[in-house]
Every structure is written in C-alpha cells, then in structure tokens.
C-alpha cells in the first residue's frame, strides 16, 4: 500500500515524524518543492521539544522552515494553525523589513544561528528541513 511505516533512508525518526536535513541551500519555494517531491513538507514546529530537536540537528546555521506570510497572514505549510500554535521568534521579529534593498519585505521564516526564528527574503539560499509524518496505522503498538 501507500502507507509510510518507517522513515526513508537518510531521514531521522523522531516522535512519529521523519526529518531530513539539507547541507546545501535553496530559495524557500525551491526548498518547499524539494520536500514535496519527497512526499514531505518544510518542517512545521509545533512544540518546544520539536524546536530543540531540529535545532540540535541543524546547528547554528540559517535554515528554512515551513512558515510564510506570502499571501498575507502567517501560515504553516501543512495547515497547522499559526495563531494558537508554538512560536519562537527573535525579539522584535517578524518585522517584514524592507531595508535589505532586494525589493519587497520579508515573507519566509527561518531558524537563525541561535535557533530562534526570523523572517527573511524568500529568495535567500538557506538550508532547509523536510518533515513527513509516519502513517497513523504504523503508529499503533504491535499486537503481541
């Protein structure tokens, strides 16, 4: 069948999800497409525990996550509610800064060197993290 019962090769399993950490950089939309081609999505951070897990694996490097406000309000790529969900912005972020001179503001969120989040120009070539959930059918304990 099409159920994903274990993580693909080179992915890391954690709390019923699989994670893949890039070592090269792409613009946010291209990173998003890369994840989608893997039947995954850019990482959606829903808890402090997940934040610490991802932070541990990426190190002090700017890294895209699945959060953007390209169409107005901030949205997670998997539909997780932003307003009521976990957030870990740097102080005074997001600020939709226009002073970078690249045109427009800042519409895509990334982990900064200390793990906290910042909004930045979506075209910047940052590393990225893909996430996919293990199927619910595979999460039930085996019958003994």
């Amino acid at each position: 069948g099409s159920e994903r019962t274990c993580c693909p090769v080179n992915w890391v399993e954690h709390e019923r999800s699989c994670y893949w950490f890039s070592r090269s950089g792409k613009a946010w939309a291209d990173a998003d497409n890369y994840c989608r081609l893997e039947d995954a999505h850019l990482v959606v951070v829903t808890s402090w525990e997940e934040q610490k897990f991802v932070q541990h694996h990426i190190g002090p490097v700017n890294t895209w996550m699945g959060l953007h406000d390209q169409n107005g309000p901030w949205k997670w790529v998997d539909g997780t509610d932003y307003e009521t969900g976990f957030k870990n912005w740097r102080p005074e972020q997001p600020d939709d800064w226009y002073g970078h001179g690249l045109g427009g503001g800042e519409d895509c969120a990334h982990f900064t060197d200390d793990g906290r989040w910042n909004d930045d120009v979506c075209q910047r070539p940052y590393r990225w993290v893909c996430e996919t959930e293990l199927d619910k059918a595979s999460q039930e304990p085996p019958l003994l």
């Epitope: 693909p8 890039s22 070592r23 090269s24 890369y34 081609l37 893997e38 070539p125």
Partner: antibody, heavy 121, light 108 residues
Amino acid sequence: EVQLLESGGGLVQPGGSLRLSCSASGFTFSSYAMSWVRQAPGKGLEWVSAISGRGGSTFYADSVKGRFTISRDNSKNTLYLQMNSLRAEDTAVYYCARRLALDGYDAFDIWGQGTMVTVSS
Amino acid sequence: DIQMTQSPSSLSASVGDRVTITCRASQSISNYLNWYQQTPGKAPKLLIYAESSLQSGVPSRFSGSGSGTDFTLTISSLQPEDFATYSCQQSYSSPPWTFGQGTKVEIK
C-alpha cells in the same frame, strides 16, 4: 536491471488526446519521484511534468499546465501522462526519467528509450 | 524560470583532443548543475551531477567545474564513443528543471 519503457506515442490531430505509459522495473518504484521530459525534433530537452514517489505532489511546465496530467500506479510500477488539447508544438520524443535525490541535489539518472508523439492534421 | 545557455552550439574535434563545453545560467544556481550525454536516437545519460560529482560508471576523463552562473564540462582526451550531444541542466530552481540547448561534438 533498472529499466524504464515508454509506450503510447503516435500520430494525433491537433486538439486530440493521447495517454503515455512508462513501465518501471529493477528498482523500488514508489521510492522515487518521476518526470516526463520531451525533445522536439532537432531541439534541446524540455522538462514537462513530475510526480512525487507516492503521488502526493505533481508539477507541470507552464507550456502544458491545464492540458497534461501526470499520475502513477505504484501497484503496477507504471507512470502515466494524459495529454489533452494537443498542439503542433507538443510534437516530440517523450522520455520518462527517474529523479535521483542526493544530499539536496537532484538529477535524472535513469531514462526510458522514448516514445514519439506527432501532432499533425 | 532560469535560462541555461551553452557554448559553442557545436564543435569539431579529433580523438585524443581536450574538449571544453561551457554553460551559463541566467542567475546564480550555486553548484546545482548536471551534465548529460546523448547520442542520436538514444536517451540522455547522466554524466555529472552537483557540478563536479561523477555519476557511477562514467569514465574519469569527464570532469565538471564552476559555480554560480558559469560552468564547464571537460573531456580530457576525447574517445570515439564521446562524439555526441552534451546538455547542461540546472536543479536549483526545480521544478521547473531547465536544460541548455545542447552542444554537438563532431568528428573533425
């Protein structure tokens, strides 16, 4: 042996439809995203469409969006391209290709032999 | 979309020659650059991925270099089976993956 084999090409009138198939063998088909790439006579390669391994995501070149539909049947190890509203400029050899993903980079590492599609009245 | 431009469109060379083909991207693609070889009536064959990584089974006389917008495919000593068309492809902005128009290497 890892192999891709296309079929379904032929001569079709403008506005007509055609369905291409690509049969895969020698690898775990569902683990790979797949693409269709075409080559018009005497021209370069043009990517047409892609689909993720489990079929959850699809992508199309602007030139075929709304006319072509990519799909796959992993139980049959087969990739499809449904082509509607065909135009003369769709005339080409159509290849199916396997996407190899390595450390964030990707390339097409396995190609079929191609099937010719001719759109003419 | 990112445009890929190859030069020259064709070249004539002899067995044993060193051959260089260039590929230019319309914007920076870092090292997300692949090279393919295609002989008439056959499917393309992946030679090099990620700018300089040789695909399994490809002879070491093929090499790739470059970064950003300018890339080079070099054949250090041309062999009879190397007379073919060579195409570059970017995988930075993908999809859409885009290819160069091809460079035909002919016998002098």
